[in-house]
Interface confidence: medium
């Protein structure tokens, strides 16, 4: 399932919530083709969270990420 | 019925500023996911998108030259505009704007306007 | 910025004959999503560019279906079959992994 403010494989707005760190699975970089850069994080029930890139709690839960799932992001 | 149309100086002087306007029709730039984008085409050479424009008036550039553009819109008057700064003979191309929208048809440039031709000339 | 690469400038082709024209991108335009970012632009002689496929192989609005596109992360193919007087031009890749850019084109002629 996707999420409210994610449109098909792009992000149109950033979720303003508190992201649920322990409960993120993965994350990935929307394609340039997008209208805004954005970092989607999918939780552990599926949903995507479109973030802001430039937000310090983003890099943070990239960073979290990064260190359980030692791939990164999960790109082609 | 998409249209768009660019309009410029026509010949302009080395180091003066290129000011460049495109006017549509049949879409608005107060729908979300839509933007407006430029691209030039030196003559019998081939395409380069410069920058482009979103709805909520996010803005990106061609990184080789960020530091000489700038693009802003009129939603109210469906108009786009790009300048270039201190051009150079470099610079003489033919300059298209096209229709970006993300939405049903996620399709990238699907319109194109006539072009306008950009001569530098000392 | 990813280069792209069409390493043939033209070809020429009878009318009613196939013809397959190739691009290659320095990096793979394979998203996670699934989608591949690669588009097929035709600039018909003395006109402006129009869109033929999008996301490598999605016809656009209007486009007949004698144009395909297919490939893989970092070589793409525009297939025409059937070619008609109408499809001469300069057949332009795109891609939009990341900031657009433009293959340098590769000139359709009639034998």
């Known amino acids: 399932a996707r999420g409210t403010n994610v449109g098909r494989e792009c992000c149109l707005e950033y979720f303003k919530g508190a992201i649920p760190i322990s409960r993120l699975t993965r994350w990935y970089k929307t394609s340039g083709e997008c209208p805004k850069d954005a970092i989607v994080f999918v939780t552990v029930q599926g949903k995507s969270i479109c973030s802001d890139p430039k937000d310090k709690r983003v890099k943070k839960a990239v960073r979290y990420l990064q260190r359980t799932w030692k791939g990164g992001p999960q790109e082609s | 019925q998409v249209t768009l149309k660019e309009s410029g100086p026509g010949i302009l002087q080395p180091s003066q500023t290129l000011s460049l306007t495109c006017s549509f029709s049949g879409f608005s730039l107060n729908t979300s996911g839509m933007g407006v984008g430029w691209i030039r085409q030196p003559s019998g050479k081939g395409l380069e998108w410069l920058a482009h424009?979103?709805?909520?008036?996010?803005?990106r550039y061609n990184p080789a030259l960020k530091s000489r553009l700038t693009i802003s819109k009129d939603t109210f008057n469906n108009q786009v505009f790009l300048n270039i700064a201190s051009v150079d003979t470099a610079d003489t191309a033919t300059y298209y704007c096209?229709?970006?929208?993300?939405?049903?048809?996620?399709?990238?440039?699907?319109?194109w306007g006539q072009g306008t031709l950009v001569t530098v000339s000392a | 910025d990813i280069v792209m690469t069409q390493a043939t400038s033209s070809v020429f082709v009878t009318p009613g004959d196939s013809v397959s024209i190739s691009c290659r991108s320095s990096k793979s335009l394979l998203h996670s999503n699934g989608n591949t970012y690669l588009y097929w632009f035709l600039q018909r002689p003395g006109q402006s560019p129009q869109l033929l496929i999008y996301?490598?192989?999605n016809l656009a609005s209007g486009v007949p279906d004698r144009f395909s596109g297919s490939g893989s992360g970092t070589a793409f193919t525009l297939r025409i079959s059937r070619v008609e007087a109408e499809d001469v031009g300069v057949y332009y890749c795109m891609q939009h992994l990341e900031n657009p850019t433009f293959g340098a084109g590769t000139k359709l002629e009639l034998k």
């Open positions: 424009i979103w709805w909520d008036d996010d803005k």
């Open positions: 996301r490598m192989s």
């Open positions: 096209a229709r970006i929208y993300f939405g049903s048809s996620l399709a990238w440039f699907a319109y």
